[in-house]
């Protein structure tokens, strides 16, 4: 039988290249059993992680997987940076690995590439 510990499965050292002006959903996969924990997002600023109080978030339940989503509608150039999700569960604070967004400002690009083109160009 699976343990009922809360776990946050943001992939270690994960990175996402995204375009300013596009919508984007940053996913925090959350494993829990009976009671859904309270989850928050923060953005790293040096060694501290600043809680994102005023951002749109939501839960998504999909094929027995739960996600706590941070919405970027749209992505802005200053969304560039590293993010972490945290869960409060039975008085314990559980922190995820950080995930980094690399934002390309399309204003400076002469021709707007497709998402898939940009991803392959950015990461290849």
């Amino acid at each position: 039988k699976e343990s009922c510990d809360v776990q946050l499965y943001i992939k270690r050292q994960s990175e996402h290249s995204i375009l300013a002006g596009d919508p984007f959903e940053l996913e925090c996969p959350v494993k829990y059993c009976a009671n859904r924990p309270h989850v928050t997002w923060c953005k790293l600023n040096g060694t501290t992680c600043v809680k994102l109080e005023d951002r749109q978030t939501s839960w998504k339940e999909e094929k027995n997987i739960s996600f706590f989503i941070l919405h970027f509608e749209p992505v802005l150039p200053n969304d560039n940076g590293s993010y972490r999700c945290s869960a409060n569960f039975q008085s314990n604070l559980i922190e995820s690995h950080s995930t980094t967004l690399y934002v390309t400002d399309v204003e400076s690009a002469s021709e707007r590439p497709s998402k898939d083109e940009m991803a392959s160009r950015f990461w290849a």
Epitope: Q7, Y9, K11, E15, I65, F67, H97, A119, W123
Partner: antibody, heavy 118, light 111 residues
Amino acid sequence: EVQLQESGPSLVKPSQTLSLTCSVTGDSITSAYWNWIRKFPGNKLEYMGYISYSGSTYFNPSLKSRISITRNTSKNQYYLQLNSVTTEDTATYYCARSHYYGYYFDYWGHGTTLTVSS
Amino acid sequence: DIVLTQSPASLAVSLGQRATISCRASETIDSYGDSLMHWYQQKAGQPPKLLIYRASNLESGIPARFSGSGSRTDFTLTINPVEADDVATYYCQQTDEDPYTFGGGTKLEIK
């Protein structure tokens, strides 16, 4: 039911480029992580890399200068390209999906066997 | 890279007996708060098949004869009792750290 199917050449000449396709049904490649793995004739399994739900990629550093992984979301396919192949790249190539809760490979393709030979 | 050392490399077990396969990691596998160590079975001509995920969780549809245990650097796959259909090569895999790595495999045969 999630299904993955690899396709591509069975024979490639040294120094050429290998291109493989993984066609996915039963799930969208805009969720989870989609991987390439290969198995050498001596039975060693090597992890090659992934493309994520957002389109970002990770490559095994041992292959980084030669590999790219791309996708076509409208076809629900992702692709492996391996440049400058040698006989050492002779292997069976698998595509597989990683589960979000721990990244284990819960669905695999049947594999496609590649021989690199002149 | 995290190196996974499997032992033994091959194993011959009588039907109905217990088979135990060990996987030792060169670094601790626990950065997610649990152990991202998994076990696969591969039969000739087939892709690997997930048996155990996150050290001790039995994949859906896999018989309860298969079990996994361990933490940190030492992990074990146990098959009890062994059946004729279990003839295969078994691999451990870690997904705690990139690049993911596999053990060298353990070939199980019937004595």
